[in-house]
């Protein structure tokens, strides 16, 4: 597999440092290549674990830049995929350079949940909206999904009040607290003047990958009135 | 196992024709024995399948009659048991005579269900009471029992009306129709003067053994009045 | 009476399994099945029991005198345990046929281990709604 | 992160199961598990899968370099699949250890066949009441 792609012993150098980065389920392959007198073009192929006839599938063909978005080639984000890149200069092709095994769910990053905070009677209601990811151009939430093991299993919610911080945990599979759009957390408020500041992060099932932490949102309670 | 029970070559004849009969879960062992100048006594032993340390257990010791009630030695009536009988004359013992494999549920007989019949509005209600059996001295119904595969799975109910007979089937596991005491069947009645005669039999799960058929009970409908 | 009963009695004769010494040293399956009432626990145990019988029947596949009995029993097992569902039976058979000494099978098994483990606990009993637009489908 | 994850990644290195050729010829278990949503169907399949892993681990019991990983994973399997219930695990292990070529085991299996078959279909889903005084208890 590390031999030449087509022709005999090749004078075309192999791409180096093939890496994959993923943000919100959008994996992009990067590689490096030495400066050549003639402009090289690259072909990127992807192989997925768990596809019936697992073969190397073309993701980008004869491109000149050094990256390739392979999000259309991701099946179950818990499954592994591998990438290989070859260079072509004129009629000659290099050997393939291969990536390490990559699993979008294990090795990628997920953006933060969005937060909303409001006062209702004697409690503060916190809405935690599941992070949105773009899959095949569709915006979707990283909600519990019986079809994959890649979903946010728990939210860590950090509540600061007058300097002291309490951490709450919300299990996303508990239907009382969560639906496919958001989770809710109710916090009783004391009657004192207090500022409540809240941030949250999700923890993905299996690999325990943590999403980015949300920006802190605050609410101030004056006796029983509210100042956002 | 067919050798002598204690002493050397025995001149004491072996019992013959060891058979088991069971009615309403009460198995009794019978055997035959030749006439002897000295009165013989018999020991009956039982071995059950499914008992942890399966050994021959004494059921009747040194009895002079030719039968032995072994109902205290029945575990799950679906499980097999075997019986062996030896004779003793004075100090000498015979070899054991052994029964065939016997399963109370497969090889025994069960008495009939009891029936009750009455008219309610525009239908006849038939109550089918599960046959009673005596297990370890306790009266119990042959109701569906998740602890054993030996229970009445279905009742065949035969309804005769003016010469023609219809057969109904009642599944005992359907809670709408049955409980631990009885099953119920509702039959719509025509407005004509008619006599309805009903009998029923149970069919046991697995071996499909049929209980005895109940006596026929009848009810006569005059327009909308009843004569039992 | 289900068709398997007569054929199983026939097999008992063939294997001399109606003799009293068969009772020695307890039961194989019946005692274990008595321990588990919960349907999913029963299926865990029955899965092993059924695969044992299929292996046993395979060992006697060349014995013509019991072929009809074996086929009838297998058929009834497929009806009762697999609900006559050929796909369920085929998937089950694939699993029972994997060779634990095959290097490629070993590597695949280890590769899949994390995801298999992640699914071992029963799914949350919430009857959790399924999104109309499912996530992460490739 | 559950303890098994790190140890399973360790096993992947040991078995070279992270290389792309491991993807050839489809999945062993994951594809099958995707087919079955119903909890009892999943248990039928998972029962076979778990017994496969236990056999695989047994084959490598003398390999000291992966013993800690294997033990951690087995422990986590016991927690997840057997709900930390030792009796369940023991019954399961008994079933997986019966030898299909042992004559006494064969005879017992055939003796028990009728009753095993009678219990194969799921119990009536009625939540049927259980009598206080159970029938036929020996």
């Amino acid at each position: 597999e590390m031999g030449t792609a087509d022709l005999g012993p090749s004078s075309v150098p192999t791409p180096t440092n093939v890496t994959i980065e993923s943000y919100n389920m959008n994996p992009i392959v990067y590689w490096e290549y030495q400066i050549m007198p003639q402009v090289p073009v690259f072909t990127v192929e992807v192989k997925n674990y768990g596809v019936k006839n697992s073969e190397w599938i073309d993701a980008c063909i004869n491109i000149s830049h050094h990256y390739c978005n392979i999000s259309d080639h991701v099946g179950d984000p818990s499954n592994s995929l591998w990438v290989r890149v070859k260079a072509r200069v004129g009629q000659k092709e290099s050997a393939y350079a291969k990536s390490e095994e990559f699993a979008v769910c294990r090795d990628g990053k997920i953006g933060p949940p969005k937060l909303d905070i409001r006062k209702e009677e004697k409690q503060i209601m916190i809405d935690i909206f599941h992070p949105s990811v773009f899959v095949n151009g569709d915006e979707q939430e990283v909600d519990y999904d019986p079809e994959t093991t890649c979903y946010i299993r728990v939210y860590n919610v950090y509540v600061r009040m007058n300097g002291s911080e309490i951490q709450y945990k919300i299990l996303t599979q508990k239907e009382d607290d969560c639906d496919e759009i958001q989770c809710q957390l109710a916090i009783p408020v004391s009657s004192l003047n207090s500022q409540y500041c809240v941030s949250a992060e999700g923890v993905l099932h299996v690999w325990g990958v943590t999403t980015e932490k949300s920006k802190e949102v605050c609410i101030t309670i004056f006796n029983s009135s509210i100042k956002g | 196992e067919m050798g002598t029970a204690d002493l050397g070559p025995s001149s004491v004849p072996t019992p013959t024709n060891v058979t088991i009969e069971s009615y309403n879960m009460n198995p009794i062992v019978y055997w035959e024995y030749q006439i002897m100048p000295q009165v013989p006594v018999f020991t009956v032993e039982v071995k059950n399948y499914g008992v942890k340390n399966s050994e021959w257990i004494d059921a009747c010791i040194n009895i002079s009659h030719h039968y032995c009630n072994i109902s205290d030695h029945v575990g799950d009536p679906s499980n097999s048991l075997w019986v062996r009988v030896k004779a003793r004359v004075g100090q000498k013992e015979s070899a054991y005579a052994k029964s065939e494999e016997f399963a109370v549920c497969r090889d025994g007989k069960i008495g009939p269900p009891k029936l009750d019949i009455r008219k309610e509005e525009k239908q006849i209600m038939i109550d089918i009471f599960h046959p009673s059996v005596f297990v370890n001295g306790d009266e119990q119904e042959v109701d569906y029992d998740p602890e054993t595969t030996c229970y009445i799975r279905v009742y065949n109910v035969y309804v005769r009306m003016n010469g023609s007979e219809i057969q109904y089937k009642i599944l005992t596991q359907k809670e709408d129709d049955c409980d631990e005491i009885q099953c119920q069947l509702a039959i719509p009645v025509s407005s004509l003067n008619s006599q309805y005669c009903v009998s029923a039999e149970g069919v046991l799960h697995v071996w499909g053994v049929t209980t005895e058929k109940s006596k026929e009970v009848c009810i006569t409908i005059f327009n909308s009045s009843i004569k039992g | 009476q289900d068709p398997y009963v007569k054929e199983a009695e026939n097999l008992k004769k063939y294997f001399n399994a109606g003799h009293s010494d068969v009772a020695d040293n307890g039961t194989l399956f019946l005692g274990i099945l008595k321990n588990w009432k919960e349907e999913s626990d029963r299926k865990i145990m029955q899965s092993q029991i059924v695969s044992f019988y299929f292996k046993l029947f395979k060992n006697f596949k060349d014995d013509q005198s019991i072929q009809k009995s074996v086929e009838t029993i297998k058929e009834d097992m497929n009806v009762k345990f697999f609900n006559s569902n050929k796909k369920k039976r085929d998937d089950f058979e694939k699993l029972t046929n994997y060779s634990v000494t095959d290097l490629n099978v070993q590597r695949k098994a280890i590769h899949e281990l994390i995801q298999v483990m992640a699914e071992l606990s029963p799914a949350a009993k919430t009857g959790k709604r399924k999104r109309s637009q499912m996530l992460f489908r490739g | 992160q559950d303890p098994y994850v790190k140890e399973a990644e360790n096993l992947k290195k040991y078995f070279n199961a992270g290389h792309s050729d491991v993807a050839d010829n489809g999945t062993l278990f994951l594809g099958i598990l995707k087919n079955w949503k119903e909890e009892s169907d999943r248990k039928i399949m998972q029962s076979q899968i778990v017994s496969f892993y236990f056999k695989l681990f047994k084959n490598f019991k003398d390999d000291q370099s992966i013993q800690k990983s294997v033990e951690t994973i087995k422990e986590d399997m016991n927690v997840k699949f057997f709900n930390s219930n030792k009796k369940k695990r023991d019954d399961f292990e008994k079933l997986t250890n019966y030898s299909v070529t042992d004559l006494n085991v064969q005879r017992k299996a055939i003796h028990e066949l009728i009753q095993v078959m009678a219990e194969l279909s799921p119990a009536a889903k009625t939540g049927k009441r259980k009598r206080s005084q159970m029938l036929f208890r020996g």
Epitope: K52 | - | P3, E75, N78, V79, N83, S84, N85, K86, K87, K88, D90 | K34, N35, W36, K37, E38, D41
Partner: antibody, heavy 123, light 112 residues
């Protein structure tokens, strides 16, 4: 080559009866489950009835249960469908079909199909 | 009982690829095999895909079948369309309680 040849169709009045036959050749008839599938004029396919290879198990669609009876004679390699209490909505081409996979006692998929026989129920 | 829903009709030009879907109304599409039958006008049905994705011998590899659990549907894909592919296509599955269900059928028109 596997061949299935249906016969016995025709015009019958509502409430009447008809018996369809399907003569099979080119395979071990008793090893395969068999089925009847029908197709009303201009409409889709509807499974009607099935029978196991031995003939011991039979299955019916709700729409024909109690009126139709499937049977087979393995010595004659023939499948039958006895149709009683016929209704206008039973009008269709009736196909006999062999199970596509042997050794599975309920049909699993249908292959091949016969050429069909037309049953018309009309007064 | 579940239903299998197919589009009434699809059309595409020769040489192109067409996909016909078959959506199961309840229960999992993956838990029983799905078959696909082709019925040309005036002829009996013939199998083009069995057991989700298997092709009988004699059926060209332009025909492929797949299952998508997320949409609870099966698909028949025909690539390199030819005029002879013009026909009605039916999906079929078993319902787990001794009934065999067919989809309503899809009329494929090859344009031109």
């Amino acid at each position: 080559e596997v061949q299935l040849l249906e016969s016995g169709g025709g015009l019958v009045q509502p409430g009447g009866s008809l018996r369809l036959s399907c003569a099979a050749s080119g395979f071990t008839f008793s090893s395969y489950a068999m089925s009847w599938v029908r197709q009303a004029p201009g409409k889709g396919l509807e499974w009607v009835s099935a029978i196991s290879g031995s003939g011991g198990s039979t299955y019916y669609a709700d729409s024909v249960k109690g009126r139709f009876t499937i049977s087979r004679d393995n010595s004659k390699n023939t499948l039958y469908l006895q149709m009683n209490s016929l209704r206008a909505e039973d009008t269709a081409v009736y196909y006999c079909a062999k199970d596509g996979s042997s050794g599975w006692y309920v049909p699993h998929w249908f292959d091949p199909w016969g050429q069909g026989t037309l049953v018309t129920v009309s007064s | 009982n579940f239903m299998l829903t197919q589009p009434h009709s699809v059309s595409e030009s020769p040489g192109k690829t067409v996909t016909i879907s078959c959506t199961r109304s309840s229960g999992s599409i993956a838990s029983n095999y799905v078959q696909w039958y082709q019925q040309r006008p005036g002829s009996s049905p013939t199998t083009v895909i069995y057991e989700d994705n298997q092709r009988p011998s004699g059926v060209p590899d332009r025909f492929s079948g797949s299952i998508d659990s997320s949409s609870n549907s099966a698909s028949l894909t025909i690539s390199g369309l030819k005029t002879e592919d013009e026909a009605d296509y039916y999906c079929q599955s078993y319902d787990g309680s001794n009934r065999w269900m067919f989809g309503g059928g899809t009329k494929l028109t090859v344009l031109g």
